[in-house]
């Protein structure tokens, strides 16, 4: 807290300008009018105040707006945003995408801070859903943003917003998140032709069920091994050797290198060795000839 002292004669700030960088903290407190600061916030970002000076300016705004800053001030906070706490930000009502962009720009190149996370949360809640423009903006600044959301939060993403998602935005998503996103992607891209559809849906396939993988295997998609390895194990297990061969096309040879890893390992254990041998890859571990395969899960469902 800065002590209340009278402003020295001739030091009263008539405008927010660069000469204020020389003001001691108590001089800033005494000589800068909070209302003047609020109306000229756009200038603050261009002036190289020290962090301690920014603390004083923040304190002045806090006194002027105890219930939270208006958006006209928030939009021009610039570096002062780095001084805000999540508690400060929870008082704000941010509705403009331009304001959001301006503040994310300040934090650009850094990890998502608690302040930024709170800001995004306030913004998205205010909008009611993650619309395409918002998602576009957020993933541009934070490629991992989408995967930081819970499945419940992802359920509010409209299918139309999926067009904004890039493959790298999904890199850190887990299967539960992809389970939510995949049906939305399927809906979003449903009117595209085969090859274009596969290019778009590929990064979401970690949430695809068996029947969709079977359908893809009929379309000459040539799925790469990296994508195959991210598929749900329970979705891959029912696929036949012929279906996997069609699904992977020329990439089927890559199965040998992955035979010890899931889902390939578990899938091999479910196939007849005879069928695996038709691939000519030397895959081992399938069911020997003459053995009967009982699907216990089906048996349990019937009883």
């Amino acid at each position: 807290e800065v002590e209340k002292t009278a402003c020295p004669s001739g030091k009263k700030a008539r405008e927010i300008d660069e000469s204020l960088i020389f003001y001691k903290k108590w001089e800033l407190e005494a000589c800068v009018d909070a209302a003047l600061l609020a109306t000229q916030m756009d200038r603050v970002n261009a002036i190289p105040f020290t962090y301690e000076q920014l603390d004083v300016l923040k304190h002045k705004l806090d006194e002027l707006y105890p219930q939270g800053y208006p958006e006209s001030v928030i939009q021009h906070l610039g570096y002062l945003f780095l001084k805000m706490s999540p508690e400060d930000i929870r008082k704000w009502n941010v509705t403009s995408l331009e304001t959001l962009k301006a503040l994310l720009e300040v934090n650009k190149g850094h990890e998502m801070s608690p302040q930024v996370a709170t800001l995004i949360d306030r913004f998205v809640k205010g909008r009611g859903q993650l619309d395409k423009d918002t998602l576009d903006t957020l993933t541009a600044f934070y490629p991992g943003y989408l995967c930081s959301l819970s499945p419940e939060e992802l359920s509010s993403v409209p299918p139309s917003s999926i067009w904004a998602v890039r493959p790298q935005d999904l890199d850190t998503c887990d299967p539960r998140q992809l389970d939510v996103l995949y049906p939305k992607a399927r809906l979003a891209f449903q009117n595209m032709n085969g090859s274009e559809y596969f290019v778009k849906i590929q990064s979401f396939l970690g949430g695809a069920p068996t029947e969709d993988l079977k359908a893809l295997s009929q379309q000459n998609v040539s799925m790469d091994l990296a994508t195959f390895m991210k598929l749900r194990t329970d979705a891959v297990l029912p696929l036949t050797v012929a279906e996997v061969q069609k699904l992977l096309g020329p990439h089927v040879e890559g199965l040998k290198a992955e035979e010890r890893h899931r889902p390939v390992r578990d899938w091999i254990l479910r196939q007849r060795q005879d069928d695996l041998d038709t691939l000519g890859l030397g895959l081992q571990g399938g069911i020997p000839n003459g053995y009967l395969v009982l699907d216990l899960s089906m048996q349990e469902a019937l009883s």
């Epitope: 300008d17 660069e18 960088i21 903290k25 190289p48 962090y51 301690e52 920014l54």
Partner: nanobody, 127 residues
Framework: EVQVVESGGGLVQAGASLRLSCASS????????MAWFRQAPGKERELVAG???????YYSDSVKGRFTISRDNAKNTVYLQMDSLKFEDTAVYFC?????????????????????WGQGTQVTVSS
């Protein structure tokens, strides 16, 4: 790397004038701030006058109206014109330049903010 060299100090009578010069070299753009500090025996170094990269000026209360800070961009030189000198102006005067990219320090009135310093020039005012 910025080099800063002061000149112009000396011994004068109270009421007289002096002009200090601060020549900087080693860079093509103006630092964020150039400032004149002074340090009297047994006292802390204090800001006398400051000049921003845009030409805005600042003066400490003790010299306001008597001292003028200015610069000549062509010569990369900052001046401190000192008029109506008083006995209490006696000190070593230092020129400082600062770029402060990480905004450390308390304010630009604090010597800790400046990266580049001259060796100082002695100003003695006799009464």
């Amino acid at each position: 790397e910025v080099q800063v060299v002061e000149s112009g100090g000396g011994l004068v009578q109270a009421g007289a004038s002096l002009r200090l010069s601060c020549a900087s070299s080693g860079r093509t753009i103006s630092p964020i701030a150039m400032a004149w500090f002074r340090q009297a025996p047994g006292k802390e170094r204090e800001l006398v006058a400051g000049l921003t990269w845009t030409g805005r000026t600042y003066y400490s209360d003790s010299v306001k109206g008597r001292f003028t800070i200015s610069r000549d961009n062509a010569k990369n030189t900052v001046y401190l014109q000192m008029d109506s000198l008083k006995f209490e102006d006696t000190a070593v005067y230092f020129c400082a330049a600062g770029d402060n990219p990480d905004r450390r320090g308390s304010s630009w009135s604090s010597s800790s903010v400046y990266e580049y310093w001259g060796q100082g020039t002695q100003v003695t005012v006799s009464s």
